[in-house]
């Protein structure tokens, strides 16, 4: 299953990055799980994950650094609290969970650049 | 199963990166699991993961650094808490979980760049 996501995203000065994860036509998929993975070298770590259905909105856990909305086969993801050290490749993994058959696809990743703002000068 | 994701994403100064993960036609997949992996050299670490259905929204765990939304075969992922040291290749892995048969696909990865901002100059 094909998963598309932007190649590069520049996080805002507030440390928030948003991007769209789009997957191949879901057909009759009723439950879809989206996972954002961060790849550092050969290591992949899960940043966040959420499941949504055709009737319910995308819902991340309360303490998740991610938020988002879904529309058809597109998921608008927003990651907050980003720091320059978080710059890296973020991979969107989409799983069509139910009903059978199960399909899974991973995007090529979105390079997210986070630039820490320079400290403001002190005022005398 | 083909998974598409952007090649590069620049994270915001807040350490948040968003991108779209798109996977091949899911047919009647009802449950999809998306995992974002971070590749560092030969090592892959899971950044985040979430399962969603056609009826329930994408949902990452509460403590996940990711948020996102889904739309058909596209997932908009947002990763929060990114740091410059997190810069790397993030692979989107999509698994069509249910109903059978099981399908899995991984994107080529999205290079996410996180840039730490320079310190602000002092004022005299």
């Amino acid at each position: 299953m094909h998963v598309a996501q932007p190649a590069v995203v520049l996080a805002s000065s507030r440390g928030v990055a948003s991007f769209v994860c789009e997957y191949g036509s879901s057909g009759n998929a009723a439950e879809v799980r989206v996972t954002v993975l961060r790849q550092a070298g050969s290591q992949m770590t899960e940043v966040c994950a959420a499941t949504y259905t055709v009737e319910d909105e995308l819902a991340f856990l309360d303490d998740s650094t991610c938020t988002g909305t879904s529309s058809g086969n597109k998921v608008n993801l927003t990651i907050q609290g980003l720091r320059a050290m978080d710059t890296g490749l973020y991979i969107c993994k989409v799983e069509l969970m139910y009903p059978p058959p199960y399909y899974v696809g991973m995007g090529n990743g979105t390079q997210i650049y986070v630039i820490d703002p320079e400290p403001c000068p002190d005022s005398d | 199963m083909h998974v598409a994701q952007p090649a590069v994403v620049l994270a915001s100064s807040r350490g948040v990166a968003s991108f779209v993960c798109e996977y091949g036609s899911s047919g009647n997949a009802a449950e999809v699991r998306v995992t974002v992996l971070r590749q560092a050299g030969s090592q892959m670490t899971e950044v985040c993961a979430a399962t969603y259905t056609v009826e329930d929204e994408l949902a990452f765990l509460d403590d996940s650094t990711c948020t996102g939304t889904s739309s058909g075969n596209k997932v908009n992922l947002t990763i929060q808490g990114l740091r410059a040291m997190d810069t790397g290749l993030y692979i989107c892995k999509v698994e069509l979980m249910y109903p059978p048969p099981y399908y899995v696909g991984m994107g080529n990865g999205t290079q996410i760049y996180v840039i730490d901002p320079e310190p602000c100059p002092d004022s005299d």
Partner: antibody, heavy 116, light 112 residues
Framework: QIQLVQSGPELKKPGETVKISCKAS????????VSWVKQAPGKGLRWMGW????????TYVDDFKGRFAFSLETSASTAFLQINNLKNEDTAIYFC?????????WGQGTTLTVSS | DVLMTQTPLSLPVSLGDHASISCKSS???????????LEWYLQKPGQSPKLLIY???KRFSGVPDRFSGSGSGTDFTLKISRVEAEDLGVYYC?????????FGGGTKLEIK
């Protein structure tokens, strides 16, 4: 509102063919699969299989392979159940049902009577 | 195939009583993703079945809170806290975890 409306009752002879329709409204037809369920007189419910309304691919339970065929007319948001070479044991009420993660909406049922 | 066994076959009750219906599967119906697609339907005479509960314990929209579902693995239960006249009919459990999906044989809830 969401509705599944089935065609009317049918009286057929053994060996004949019947085609039952199930017209959906109130939602995007190709988003949900359509299942077919058989209920013989005085009996319980039996899932016959389903058809992927996006791809058109049908899945049949073993007992309903051969003489049974699911099909679609997507432009009319309609699913069909065709039964060939009818037998007396095909006498039953046939339901169509929308399925996402459950059979949340059902047709009213079509009564098929097969008698010589 | 997964066999779904319901008990009792018939359940005579008085209005206002509590009612409990059991459904046992011949094997675990936990799907590979960890979810259990166990549902309960009510069919009244001359009508099509209506969804009450899905994913073991989630009430469908519009279903009164006197209906509740519970269970895990292979043992599941539907409870009605206070039976009303409109609750009479045949209750079916259903598993959608393993193809072919299967219904239980049904439990008839009737007045004593």
């Amino acid at each position: 509102q969401i509705q599944l409306v089935q065609s009317g009752p049918e009286l057929k002879k053994p060996g004949e063919t019947v085609k039952i329709s199930c017209k959906a409204s109130g939602y995007t037809f190709t988003t949900y699969g359509v299942s077919w369920v058989k209920q013989a007189p005085g009996k319980g419910l039996r899932w016959m299989g389903w058809i992927n309304t996006y791809s058109g691919m049908p899945t049949y339970v073993d007992d309903f392979k051969g003489r049974f065929a699911f099909s679609l007319e997507t432009s009319a948001s309609t699913a069909f159940l065709q039964i060939n070479n009818l037998k007396n044991e095909d006498t039953a009420i046939y339901f169509c049902a929308r399925r996402g993660i459950s059979f949340d909406y059902w047709g009213q049922g079509t009564t098929l009577t097969v008698s010589s | 195939d997964v066999l779904m066994t319901q008990t009792p076959l018939s359940l005579p009750v008085s209005l206002g009583d509590h009612a409990s219906i059991s459904c046992k599967s011949s094997q675990s119906i936990v799907y590979i993703n960890g979810n259990t697609y166990l549902e309960w339907y009510l069919q009244k005479p001359g009508q099509s079945p209506k969804l009450l509960i899905y994913k073991v314990s989630k009430r469908f929209s519009g279903v009164p809170d006197r209906f509740s579902g519970s269970g895990s693995g292979t043992d599941f239960t539907l409870k009605i806290s206070r039976v009303e006249a409109e609750d009479l009919g045949v209750y079916y459990c259903f598993q959608g975890s393993h193809v072919p999906w299967t219904f239980g044989g049904g439990t008839k809830l009737e007045i004593k």
